[in-house]
């Protein structure tokens, strides 16, 4: 069951008392009436904040990144951690708070005029150095318009999937990330059995396209766990 810890940064449309009206005719959106809040007090403070398990930075909040909570800790146990402010040490861009990026192991301000050039320079100079790669955010988030004005084609370097053209996602390729095609029906996909395991992939695949999910191929049910083949199949 889900515990009810309300994130104080995201309070929106506080609902009317239970049993309130279910919306105003003529408007597409309304505040939420009659809500069931599991676990009691719906206004629990951020002090009761529970660590949020994650596999990649993109699953965290905008002011967080995904990492092991202890230095040199088990890579399989990762949670969302508060982002690092300017002049703090970093290993990748996602560790730095919004408005900053990671340069030479330190979070520095993203000067609007120079940011794109700095990022491209980082990719060129340190290809193969995992500590300065561009870690992505998400296949459903958007990138600041100050960085990229056109959507990347297949093979273009990207930060996150919204940098890529329609039908492409941003996936790891060696120690960088590039736009790759979203998987179609019947194509082999990666099913991650262990949380965080796709952080280890050098050649990451995209997710399955709309209406498809990554499932074990029917004729491979008898195969051993290690050799099971997963493909994109209709729901």
């Amino acid at each position: 069951t889900l515990n009810s810890v309300l994130n104080s940064n995201a309070i929106k449309n506080l609902p009317p008392p239970l049993g309130g009206a279910a919306g105003h005719p003529g408007s597409a959106v309304s505040a939420a009436p009659g809500i069931l809040y599991p676990g009691g007090n719906k206004y629990q403070t951020i002090d009761n904040y529970q660590p949020y398990p994650c596999a990649e930075d993109e699953e965290c909040g905008t002011d967080e990144y995904c990492a092991s909570p202890t230095r040199g800790g088990d890579a399989g146990v990762q949670i969302c951690l508060a982002c690092r402010k300017r002049r703090k040490r970093c290993m990748r861009h996602a560790m730095c708070c919004p408005g900053n990026y990671c340069k030479n192991g330190i979070c520095v301000s993203s000067d609007q005029n120079h940011f794109r050039g700095e990022i491209e320079e980082t990719i060129t100079e340190s290809f193969g150095n995992d500590h300065s790669t561009l870690d992505g955010y998400s296949r459903r988030t958007t990138l600041s318009s100050k960085m990229y004005h056109t959507k990347g084609q297949e093979g273009s370097v990207c930060l996150r999937s919204s940098d890529c053209a329609s039908g492409l996602c941003c996936a790891r390729h060696f120690w960088s990330k590039i736009c790759k095609p979203v998987l179609k029906e019947g194509q082999v996909c990666t099913k991650h059995r262990r949380k965080g395991s796709h952080g280890l992939e050098i050649f990451q695949r995209c997710y399955c396209g709309e209406g498809l999910s990554c499932r074990i191929q029917k004729d491979h049910h008898q195969a051993s766990n290690s050799s099971r083949l997963h493909t994109c199949q209709r729901h």
Epitope: Y49, E59, R140
Partner: nanobody
């Protein structure tokens, strides 16, 4: 301004399937979690499930796990709720909802209704 319009509701027999759609506009779809809630007659609104802004994390209520599937199509700014093996107790008004990616995310962020903007709802009736 966030606008959410649900469609696909209707009458279905027990054991049947329905697919609800939620067309979103007025915001950057990829920066929001898309959730589904429902409210049965005389009951409180309850969390059904949600897909996060990354599309990687999908959460379901225990009552629908294994029967319902949530997905989102960025290119169409649309979220979906595929409902299979429907039961009479699934009868309710189903609401699509959108919650922005917060600065800090907690375990219960997706099931906490006050984080969301809401659609008008679509009625699903499961009856023979």
């Amino acid at each position: 301004e966030v606008q959410l319009v649900e469609s696909g509701g209707g009458l279905v027999q027990p054991g049947g399937s329905l697919r609800l759609s939620c067309a979103a506009s007025g915001f950057t779809f990829g920066d929001y979690a898309m959730g589904w809630f429902r409210q049965a007659p005389g009951k409180e609104r309850e969390f059904v499930g949600a897909i996060d802004w990354s599309g990687r994390r999908i959460t379901y209520a225990d009552s629908v796990k294994g029967r319902f599937t949530i997905s989102a199509d960025n290119s169409k700014n649309t979220a979906y709720l595929q409902m299979n093996s429907l039961k009479p107790e699934d009868t309710a008004v189903y609401y699509c909802a959108a919650a922005p990616r917060p600065k800090r995310v907690s375990v219960s962020y997706f099931s906490t209704a006050s984080n969301y903007d809401w659609g008008q709802g679509t009625l699903v009736t499961v009856s023979s």
